[in-house]
């Protein structure tokens, strides 16, 4: 007595490693009071859910803390939030609404999540020109990273005299006091998304005038 429903939207979604994706899911009906079960997202072919709101159910260790069921039956919402996407999240998923107390449940169609290599790169902002002996704040930002993801780790590489300035979740400030001999040298901002184990970087050449 399983009731099947179609997930709205595309049959597959693409996300880059380390980033986030929302798998949209909308219940086919407003649930009556008589049916008020728990929601589960499953990897195709698996018995243990990747995400659930059932307090008595374990989820797969690989997805714990990264996959979240955004459950709001009042708004028919059963979407799956994935953060810190990893290559091995590349799979087909489906949603199931089930209560062990009730005979019937609701099962969605499958949706494939494709996890691609991280091609986004950080942006380095230099306000104005670099002058010898004058300190400047350089900002490395990853505005394309998602809010709910694990905050990335920023690293700077430079031969010039530097110190670290303030950082936000998605940006880091480097205070640089360049010397004449630093002209033409490389400055690299490296950003590691530890939640997924991927790194991206950008290198610029310093123009000290």
């Amino acid at each position: 007595q399983e009731r099947r429903f179609q997930l709205e939207g595309p049959e597959s979604l693409t996300v880059q490693e380390g980033l986030c994706v929302l798998v949209p899911c909308r219940l086919p009906t407003t649930l009556p009071a008589s049916y008020y079960g728990y929601g589960y997202w499953f990897l195709e072919g698996a018995d243990v859910p990747v995400a659930t709101n059932d307090p008595d159910e374990e989820v797969q260790e690989e997805t714990r803390g990264r996959f979240h069921l955004l459950w709001d039956p009042r708004r028919k919402n059963c979407s799956l939030s994935i953060r810190d996407a990893r290559r091995r999240d590349n799979a087909a998923y489906f949603f199931r609404l089930k209560s062990k107390w009730m005979k019937y449940g609701y099962t969605s169609s499958k949706l494939s999540v494709r996890v691609m290599a991280l091609t986004h790169r950080p942006k380095i902002l230099i306000p104005g020109t670099l002058e010898p002996g004058h300190s400047k704040n350089l900002t490395c930002s990853v505005s394309w990273a998602c809010e709910q993801g694990t905050p990335p780790i920023f690293s700077w590489l430079s031969a010039a005299p530097t110190s670290l300035g303030p950082r936000t979740t998605h940006s880091s400030v480097l205070i640089i006091t360049p010397r004449p001999q630093d002209h033409g040298t490389n400055l690299t901002c490296q950003v590691k998304f530890a939640g997924a184990g991927v790194t991206t970087e950008r290198t610029i050449q310093l123009n000290v005038t």
């Epitope: 007595q1 649930l31 009556p32 009071a33 008589s34 049916y35 008020y36 709101n53 307090p55 008595d56 459950w71 709001d72 039956p73 009042r74 209560s99 062990k100 107390w101 009730m102 005979k103 019937y104």
Partner: antibody, heavy 114, light 107 residues
Framework: EVQLVESGGGLVQPGRSLRLSCAAS????????MHWVRQAPGKGLEWVAV????????YYADSVKGRFTISRDNSKNTLYLQMNSLRAEDTAVYYC???????WGKGTTVTVSS | AIRLTQSPSSLSASVGDRVTITCRAS??????LNWYQQKPGKAPKLLIY???SLQSGVPSRFSGSGSGTDFTLTISSLQPEDFATYYC?????????FGPGTKVDIK
């Protein structure tokens, strides 16, 4: 019309047993979990027990665990509550309700007294 | 077990008044909260399920709100037939506990 009718209540001495029944009609009884809820005189509602649609899952309030048994017969559309080792504090109106508690019976009164 | 507390335990109000009853859970129960009305000698009647979903046939003057641990039942304009006892109940996990009730009587 969706209906639940409890029966089997009455006066019983402490330590004795009683079996309550709840006859269901107007809906597919075998698809729904069912509850027993009780209410002592002048007191609030107390959840007693729940049983899954097929009888494979059961859960009880701590106050009745080990003494009460919830069961069902889907072929007869009937829910049961077997109450053993009854105590004075079990005196109450006993209601059966479907899983969503949107359908309730009128209740049956159980009085435990010597 | 999840404990539910209700406030106030009783209140006196007049016809036409706006009445608010609160229910607090001892831990987060998401939106798995229901509200019931009970009149003396009668079985409880489901008013609101899933914290804010109005049960079929229940007048729109009843509304529910909240999520997590704090919930509210509001009667926008109290009618004579609304004088009763109101209970919250959680269906997040077993045991499916009820709150102690709030008695609404005539001022």
């Amino acid at each position: 019309e969706v209906q639940l009718v409890e029966s089997g209540g009455g006066l019983v001495q402490p330590g004795r047993s009683l079996r309550l029944s709840c006859a269901a009609s107007g809906f597919t009884f075998s698809s729904y979990g069912m509850h027993w809820v009780r209410q002592a005189p002048g007191k609030g509602l107390e959840w007693v027990a729940v049983i899954s649609y097929d009888g494979s899952n059961k859960y009880y309030a701590d106050s009745v665990k080990g003494r009460f048994t919830i069961s069902r017969d889907n072929s007869k559309n009937t829910l049961y509550l077997q109450m053993n080792s009854l105590r004075a504090e079990d005196t109450a109106v006993y209601y059966c309700a479907n899983y969503g508690m949107d359908v309730w019976g009128k209740g049956t009164t159980v009085t435990v007294s010597s | 077990a999840i404990r539910l507390t209700q406030s106030p335990s009783s209140l006196s109000a007049s016809v036409g008044d706006r009445v608010t009853i609160t229910c607090r859970a001892s831990q987060s129960i998401s939106s798995y909260l229901n509200w019931y009305q009970q009149k003396p000698g009668k079985a409880p009647k489901l008013l609101i399920y899933a914290a804010s979903s109005l049960q079929s046939g229940v007048p729109s003057r009843f509304s529910g709100s909240g999520s997590g641990t704090d919930f509210t039942l509001t009667i926008s304009s109290l009618q004579p037939e609304d004088f009763a006892t109101y209970y919250c109940q959680q269906s997040y996990g077993t045991p499916f506990t009820f709150g102690p009730g709030t008695k609404v009587d005539i001022k």
